[in-house]
Interface confidence: low
């Protein structure tokens, strides 16, 4: 297709003619002006169809063969001829034509996206065709190979699209070119019929990737760096397949000083020094291929940016507690840039900077720098520090923002007792929240081991962390290696900038948490009356571990204690527990004896079953209430007794057995169940008692006796009783005895109201005792019956009974008191009535 | 005899006042751990406040914490719950119930007193 | 909080049937579970303690069994004073008591 014309991007003369003339008229591209502008009025591609001053007599039924012109080749390659031997027939005023010449430009290009081919038609303004209605057509060929042959396409073989010109003066041709043919040769003639004349251009050959017109650069801005520079920054189209060079061009208007500047760069921003207060910047770009042909694209939307009286930059700064950071400030005030010199700085309008934080950078521009910097305190909805740029003693009201965070955020990690996973926590309640910012985990894991200080690497990864109901974020390593570091901190994103907190480094293999210690057992054991507590090591972590058992009665709250175990090959520990009778709950737990990791949960629990660990230690303490008459020989006597406390039984008491002994029957047993009365005839002259508690292990071996004797019956050794109401809860019942040669082994006091039908009450207590405090509820205006019974060995003996209280007289207390009691007849843990002890108990 | 009786129930306003009793006789009220208990048609049985026999240690349900209190006078052997702030949810009939403390059961309940919360 | 699920949570039986009812824990409680019985105006009234242990002064046709978190009531004759709502409730993790929402047993 060397007969094709090749289209660059840059303008061309087109020359058409009537059939024989000559060449001798026709301009070269080369005497063309490149200072030509196109439709835009900038540099493009353009293609002129140019006939002035060149001689016609008859334009009917004639087509112009228009023909690219260069001093090497004379020859024009003909668009194949879809006419089809039509003729036009010319309307157009011939002396018209021949004083103004028929121009047309066109102008060719790839669109931003990549999709359509463009070539727009205009008629120039000294067109004699302007007024006739234009037909254009343009026909291509996108070749399937492209051989070395001098022929053009076969006929029939170009397509051809209408083009629209729905404007007189411009017709718009689209090409739609696959994206796989970008770098092809596109092949297309243009055919323009206007007032009956056709204007046929050559053969003209394009790659269209050459030809790309992108679209505008987007997102222009602008904005003071922290250094004080105006930055604009914009981003490059999209979808174009190559980099591109942009054309800037922006003003500046002050008070002061008017500049303007057009420069080329390659990158998407632009820094333009010497940025002055109280400015107007305006600002448009343009791109192109970088490194290959192509076409300007049309110039972004203007963007105008206007500086404050007072810059500061940068005009916020993020920064952790314990950092150094500086603020800058230039300051404009009534047209005038103030001296740095003059320039005072405030904090919050409250404190002054001292003078020594100040730096000058220049004659304008004044710095102040902060070090070891506290965190920010939140003031109100304010979460930062104002800083104040001052001209002496006149503050502007813009200032610059300090954001000041302790970054100071712990990570703790666990592994699981299956060692699978690695388990990191951390909280921001330590951390000032600020709107905007983000926060990340990121890590990086070394092969082995931490290292000893722990540092931020340039490359790490981010890990999801998830926030908890408890405010704390979790994050799950899964895969882990046990033995690698991992090397972790907490990233603050925000758009001021981000910030780190201390890293820390974690090795899997040193915070692993055991599972807990299962079959998980506790006893107590029979006989020796001692906890047994046993348990099974969890299977990881191989390590050595230790144990730590915590035991405690079962119920309420429970009062836990602890024990230790460091062997580690311990399975169980018996431990002494005060009640053996008592549900205990157990749980164990473990931890690697060498101190690293952590504690594993507590086992689930283990509770012990009450079971009897030895026969009842003694049988129950009982009474008796002899019902009938008593000058029969024949009584119902009933025995009464209370339950077995646990402590007793040992740990249970299943039932009761009653033992008789008499001269006449000898012995025999019965078998009461777990009744606490029992009920028998006493016919004979003695009668002894004995009541045994069995529990599942055997029956009691100390027990109570008592005989019931006729002839005891009447020993009368208690030669006085008194009682004395110390106050309605407490009674004092004191005795005095006779000799006697009987062996006396301890006391029955009975009591009883006389005003009600309600139960009697009984204690046995030591025979060595002389005086008791009988603790119950007493109404004062109700009658009490006392009975003091002596039990001998031989049986019980004659109660002295007392149906009243002794004179309620102080003075006859404390003299009874004194006689009746004296410090020889005090026993156990009973004292001498004394002045004091009748007035404590009188007035509490 | 051993028992319970409480009183203290009757229709009252969303955000008004009540305090339940619970008279206890026959048995030493001290040594016992003493819950209240109500029931409501939808809900069944519920735990609503405990007072061990420590006297100090007391617990509430999480949805009445802050406006009930759980009190006794073991001089007259009296249970208390004043309840405050009350809401159509806290009608109920409330028992008085007495824990036996091996295995953690209710071996003595009142006869129970009605609060009904209504405007 | 231990959750306690029991099932079914109505029934209709006739005299002299055999009856069970179940009782599902959330978490294991051991044997630390309790039966009662209640009546219409009536406070509740305990059964069976510890998960098998008969409460003194109810009839042996009761029993209870089950440990962890799956637990067995079962009136092994059903008599006509049965008729009633029955609770379960665990004392395993305390002081929040809690109780199942009931089975009512009727009369079929």
């Known amino acids: 297709f060397n007969l094709s014309y090749p289209i660059t991007p840059w303008r061309f003369k087109l020359s058409c003619m009537p059939p024989n003339s000559t060449y001798d008229y026709f301009l070269l591209p080369a005497g063309l002006s490149k200072n030509t502008s196109n439709l835009n009025g900038h540099y493009e591609t353009a293609v002129e169809f140019n006939s002035s001053d060149t001689h016609f007599s008859n334009l009917s039924k004639t087509t112009f063969h228009c023909c690219f012109r260069s001093e090497q080749d004379r020859n024009c390659s003909l668009c194949a001829d879809n006419i089809e031997g039509k003729t036009f027939v010319s309307t157009v005023n011939s002396s018209v034509f021949q004083q103004m010449g028929a121009n047309w430009n066109i102008q060719c290009w790839l669109k931003g996206d990549l999709k359509l081919f463009i070539c727009y038609v205009e008629s120039l303004f000294k067109n004699p065709f302007k007024n006739y209605k234009h037909k254009v057509h343009l026909l291509y060929v996108l070749p399937e190979v492209l051989e070395d042959s001098p022929l053009v396409p076969q006929k029939g073989s170009f397509q051809m699209v209408h083009c629209n010109c729905s404007v007189h003066e411009r017709c718009e041709c689209l090409v739609p070119v696959p994206t796989a043919k970008l770098n092809d040769t596109l092949l297309m003639c243009l055919k323009i019929t206007s007032g009956g004349v056709i204007f046929q251009s050559p053969l003209m050959s394009v790659q269209p990737i050459n030809m790309v017109k992108p679209d505008p650069p987007l997102g222009l801005r602008m904005e003071i760096t922290d250094d004080g520079n105006l930055k604009i920054s914009w981003s490059s189209p999209p979808l174009v397949p190559f980099p591109l060079q942009y054309e800037v061009k922006y003003s500046e208007n002050s008070t002061t000083v008017i500049r303007e500047a057009d420069k080329i760069v390659s990158a998407t921003s632009l820094l333009v020094d010497g940025i002055l207060p109280g400015s107007s910047y305006e600002v448009q770009v343009r791109g192109k291929r970088l490194d290959g042909p192509g076409i300007w694209s049309d110039w972004s939307t203007p963007h105008v940016f206007t500086t404050q009286d007072v810059i500061y930059f940068p005009p916020k700064i993020l920064t952790s507690v314990g950092s150094n950071v500086s603020f800058h400030c230039i300051y404009k005030n009534e047209n005038k840039i103030v001296s740095s010199k003059k320039i005072v700085w405030w904090m919050n309008l409250a404190e002054k900077i001292p003078q020594s934080q100040y730096d000058v950078v220049s004659d304008h521009v004044s710095k102040v720098t902060f070090f070891n910097l506290n965190e920010t305190k939140p003031r109100g909805k304010f979460t930062y520090d104002a800083v104040y740029c001052c001209n002496e003693h006149e503050c502007h009201h813009r200032y610059a923002e300090l954001y000041v965070i302790d970054v100071n955020i712990n990570i703790s990690c666990e592994t699981d007792g299956h060692l699978t996973k690695m388990t990191c926590r951390w909280s921001t309640n330590t951390i000032q929240s600020l709107a905007g910012s983000t926060l990340q985990l990121r890590y990086r894991r070394s092969s082995l081991y931490c290292f000893d200080i722990p540092s931020i690497h340039p490359i790490s990864k981010p890990k999801d962390c998830y926030l908890q109901s408890d405010g704390f974020y979790e994050c799950v390593f899964q895969p882990i290696f046990l033995l690698s570091g991992y090397t972790m901190w907490i990233r603050i994103n925000h758009p001021l900038g981000s910030l780190d907190s201390p890293p820390t480094c974690v090795l899997p293999d040193s915070v692993v948490k055991p599972l807990p210690p299962s079959s998980v057992k506790a006893e107590i054991i029979k006989n020796i009356g001692l906890l047994k507590i046993s348990w099974e090591k969890p299977v990881f972590p191989e390590n050595n571990l230790q144990f730590q058992i915590r035991y405690g009665l079962s119920g309420k709250e429970i009062q836990w204690k602890m024990y230790d175990v460091y062997d580690a090959k311990s399975k169980s520990v018996s431990l002494p527990v005060p009640d053996f009778c008592a549900v205990y709950a157990v749980q164990v737990r473990c931890k690697r004896s060498d101190g690293l990791g952590l504690w594993s949960n507590w086992s689930n629990p283990a509770y012990t079953v009450v079971m009897d660990i030895k026969v009842p230690m003694r049988g129950p303490e009982f009474w008796r209430i002899i019902n009938g008459d008593t000058m029969k020989k024949e009584k119902n006597v009933t025995l009464l007794w209370k339950p077995l406390m646990k402590n007793d039984s040992l740990c249970s008491v299943q039932r009761y057995v009653i033992n008789h002994h008499t001269s006449c029957n000898g012995t025999w047993s019965e078998d009461v169940g777990n009744h606490t009365k029992f009920t028998f005839l006493w016919t004979e002259q003695a009668h002894t008692v004995t009541v045994l508690a069995i529990n599942s292990i055997g029956a009691s071996v100390a027990n109570f006796n008592l005989t019931f004797s006729w002839p005891m019956s009447k020993v009368n050794i208690v030669q006085s009783l008194s009682a004395y109401p110390l106050n309605s809860s407490c009674v004092i019942l004191s005795w005095i005895l006779s000799p006697s040669d009987y062996k006396l082994m301890y006391f029955i006091i009975e009591w009883k109201n006389l005003n009600e039908d309600g139960e009697i009450k009984w204690l046995r207590i030591s025979s060595s005792v002389k005086k008791y405090y009988i603790h119950d509820h007493f109404i004062p205006i109700e009658k009490y019956q006392f009975s003091l019974y002596p039990i001998f060995m031989e049986g019980v003996g004659k109660p002295k009974i007392i149906n009243s209280f002794a004179q309620d007289n102080t003075e006859k207390h404390q003299n009874d008191e004194q006689k009746l009691i004296s410090e020889e007849d005090l026993g156990g843990e009973q004292k001498l009535i004394s002045e004091e002890d009748l007035h404590h108990h009188h007035h509490h | 005899q051993v028992q319970l009786v409480e009183s203290g129930g009757s229709v009252v306003q969303p955000g008004r006042s009540l305090r339940l009793s619970c008279a206890a006789s026959g048995f030493t009220f001290s040594t016992y751990a003493m819950y209240w208990v109500r029931q409501t048609p939808g809900k069944g049985l519920e735990w609503v406040a405990v007072l061990y026999s420590d006297g100090s240690n007391k617990y509430y349900i999480d949805s009445v914490k802050g406006r009930f209190t759980i009190s006794r006078d073991t001089s007259t052997n009296t249970l208390y719950l004043q309840m405050s702030s009350l809401r159509a949810d806290d009608s109920a009939l409330y028992y008085c119930?007495?824990?036996?403390?091996?295995?953690?059961?209710?071996?003595?309940w009142g006869r129970g007193t009605l609060v009904t919360v209504s405007s | 909080d231990i959750q306690m699920t029991q099932s079914p949570s109505s029934l209709s039986a006739s005299v002299g049937d055999r009856v069970t009812i179940t009782c599902r824990a959330s978490?294991?409680?051991?044997?630390?579970l309790n039966w009662y019985q209640q009546k219409p105006g009536k406070a509740p009234k305990l059964l069976i303690y510890?998960?098998?242990s008969l409460q003194s002064g109810v009839p042996s046709r009761f029993s209870g069994s089950g440990s962890g978190t799956d637990f067995t009531l079962t009136i092994s004759s059903l008599q006509p004073e049965d008729f009633a709502t029955y609770y379960c409730?665990?004392?395993?993790?305390?002081?929040?008591?809690?109780f199942g929402q009931g089975t009512r047993l009727e009369i079929k």
């Open positions: 978490q294991s409680i051991s044997s630390y």
């Open positions: 119930a007495r824990l036996n403390w091996d295995y953690w059961y209710f071996d003595l």
């Open positions: 409730q665990q004392s395993y993790s305390t002081p929040p008591i809690t």
């Open positions: 510890a998960a098998s």
